[in-house]
Interface confidence: low
């Protein structure tokens, strides 16, 4: 059973309704237009499939569409991260991973997007009206997350109804750099659409696209994002809260950040080995999220791509350490 | 300066409890982790378990989920560790120590809190 | 839970020396390992993190080594104030154990 907030895309004029000419005209305000609404409104899309193999076993994804860099990545249940919410799993992109009871496996799929697996026994195993929320600190845009819960009464395999869109927030408010970069094709856009007031206005046709394939569309620029249209989110107070994790579970863990970049100048590589390299405290700090900070003028030696911090093929210990647990 | 202040001495009586605390000064409290650890004479140190101050959450080693119960206090950046059903065998010096969120180890250590049971 | 074992339980040894502690691990920890000093009385204090990082403040005579299920720590020339106890502990997931202790003591 899957449970997506599918973010709802801006779609192009259909071909054909006007002219070449109309068209191309088009084509520069509504690529201005898409910029101008996605600049600094990235959106998280979080899809929740329980396993038809296990009925009390979870898999969570998340995924960013958005052009920044991705800093951090907080997976939570019962609400949001800093409102009630537990933390299940921490997910850095180059220092690697932490999860907590009663997550079983943590993983990037993607340079943008995670999957958290979840063991269902226990008095901490999820259940189906729980809701997961994904958060992803990123630069330039800031904190941005989105919840998901499936449905009390579906059933394992089928799809269900999309959940509430990303919460409307963005904890560093979206370092003003890449909007204000933009401003002026704003201003221009503005000035087109006044000229082209007798034309017909291209539709936003809300889509259900897959968050697989989020920048899948030839007409959006391929770094914006595609998402612009907002659900505001309201907290759901599920019955089913997770219980004190304590050590009883097999799984622990450590609280281990190294002081994470400010601003990452590269996309994430994928968790990468770290433990030997750990940098030493110094300088100032810069808040990102969650007590969780960045080390201004300070950058992790760079590890590309295949490296893993946890080699051993059962993983880590899921850890069920000091960051969040509640 | 870095610090954290644990309360003085304890002498309670067996089957009674005890409430320590932490006081972290120098820093922001919702930055570090504060654990637990217990220290008896000429013995290695034995971790209770943690506060975690940013939501108020706690850890528990297994074998003192029972007896034990942490809790800070954001606004006068404490910490409180509360052991009940005292034996002789809690008689130790129980220390608090502050765990950096980012990088792991405990980076700072309270002076410790002596407590001892007898009748 | 992980359990720590460290070797020697005592040394002793003279001003000037190097000396090397060992700990072992029953299962593999990574490089999650922290050595600390603890003199008589007083509080433990952390000399080195990731196995092989020195904390700040710790003079550059202590150097940690190893990973997965074996460590040490190594002081060269000793000097007066670096005798003490010696603690291993892992942070590889709760609940955290400390190793026995190693008692460094002047010839």
């Known amino acids: 059973m899957r449970t997506e907030a599918q973010v709802p895309a801006l779609q192009p004029p259909e071909p054909g309704l006007e002219g070449a000419m109309g068209h191309r005209t088009l084509v520069l305000p509504w690529v201005l237009l898409t910029l101008c609404v996605t600049a600094g409104t990235p959106e998280v899309w979080v899809q929740v499939r329980m396993e038809a193999t296990e009925l009390s076993s979870f898999t969570i994804r998340c995924g960013f569409l958005g052009s920044g860099s991705i800093s951090l990545v907080t997976v939570s249940w019962g609400g949001p991260n800093g409102a009630g919410g537990t933390t299940l799993a921490v997910l850095h992109p180059e220092r690697g991973i932490r999860q907590w009871a009663p997550a079983r496996q943590a993983r990037w799929e993607t340079q943008s997007s995670i999957s958290l697996i979840l063991e269902g026994s226990g008095a901490s195993s999820p259940c189906a009206n729980t809701t997961f929320c994904c958060k992803f600190a990123s630069f330039p845009e800031g904190s941005w997350e989105a919840c998901g819960s499936l449905p009390p009464s579906s059933d394992p395999g089928l799809s269900a109804p999309p959940t509430p869109a990303p919460i409307l927030r963005a904890d560093l408010a979206g370092i003003l750099g890449v909007s204000g970069v933009l401003l002026f094709g704003c201003v221009y856009l503005l000035h087109l659409l006044r000229r082209h007031k007798h034309r017909p206005a291209p539709r936003l046709q809300p889509s259900r696209t897959s968050p697989q394939a989020p920048r899948a569309r030839a007409w959006a620029p391929s770094q914006a994002s595609q998402a612009a249209l907002h659900v505001p989110y309201a907290t759901i107070n599920t019955s089913c809260r997770p219980a004190t994790l304590d050590t009883a579970h097999p799984h622990g863990g450590p609280s281990w950040w190294a002081s994470l970049p400010t601003h990452a100048a590269h996309r994430p590589q994928g968790p990468a080995a770290w433990a030997s390299t750990p940098i030493p405290a110094r300088g100032s700090f810069v808040s990102v999220e969650n007590g969780l900070y960045a080390q201004a003028g300070e950058r992790p030696p760079h590890t590309g791509p295949g490296l893993t911090l946890f080699p051993d093929p059962r993983g880590p210990r899921a850890m069920e350490g000091p960051l969040g647990v509640r | 300066e870095v610090q954290l202040q644990q309360s003085g001495p304890e002498l309670v009586k067996p089957g009674a409890s005890v409430k320590i605390s932490c006081k972290a000064s120098g820093y922001t409290f919702t930055d570090y982790n504060i654990h637990w650890v217990k220290q008896s004479h000429g013995k290695r140190p034995d971790w209770i378990g943690y506060n975690y101050p940013y939501n108020g959450g706690a850890g528990y080693n297994q074998n003192f989920r029972s007896r034990a119960t942490l809790t800070v206090d954001k606004f006068s950046s404490t910490a409180y560790m509360e052991l009940r059903s005292l034996t002789s065998e809690d008689s130790a010096v129980y220390y608090c120590?502050?765990?950096?969120?980012?990088?792991?180890?405990?980076?700072?250590w309270g002076q410790g809190t002596s407590v001892t049971v007898s009748s | 839970d992980i359990q720590m074992t460290q070797s020697p339980d005592s040394l002793s040894a003279s001003v000037g020396e190097t000396v090397t502690i060992t700990c072992r691990t029953s299962?593999?920890?990574?490089?999650?390992l922290v050595w600390y000093q603890q003199k008589q009385g007083k509080s433990p204090q952390l000399l080195v993190y990731n196995a092989k990082t020195l904390a700040e403040g710790v003079p550059s005579r202590f150097s940690g080594s190893g990973s997965g299920t074996q460590f040490s720590l190594k002081i060269n020339s000793l000097q007066p104030e670096d005798f003490g106890t010696y603690y291993c502990?892992?942070?590889?997931?709760?609940?955290?154990?400390f190793g026995g202790g190693t008692k460094l003591e002047i010839k």
């Open positions: 502990q892992h942070y590889y997931g709760t609940p955290y154990t």
């Open positions: 120590a502050g765990e950096e969120v980012r990088r792991g180890p405990f980076y700072f």
């Open positions: 299962e593999n920890i990574y490089s999650f």
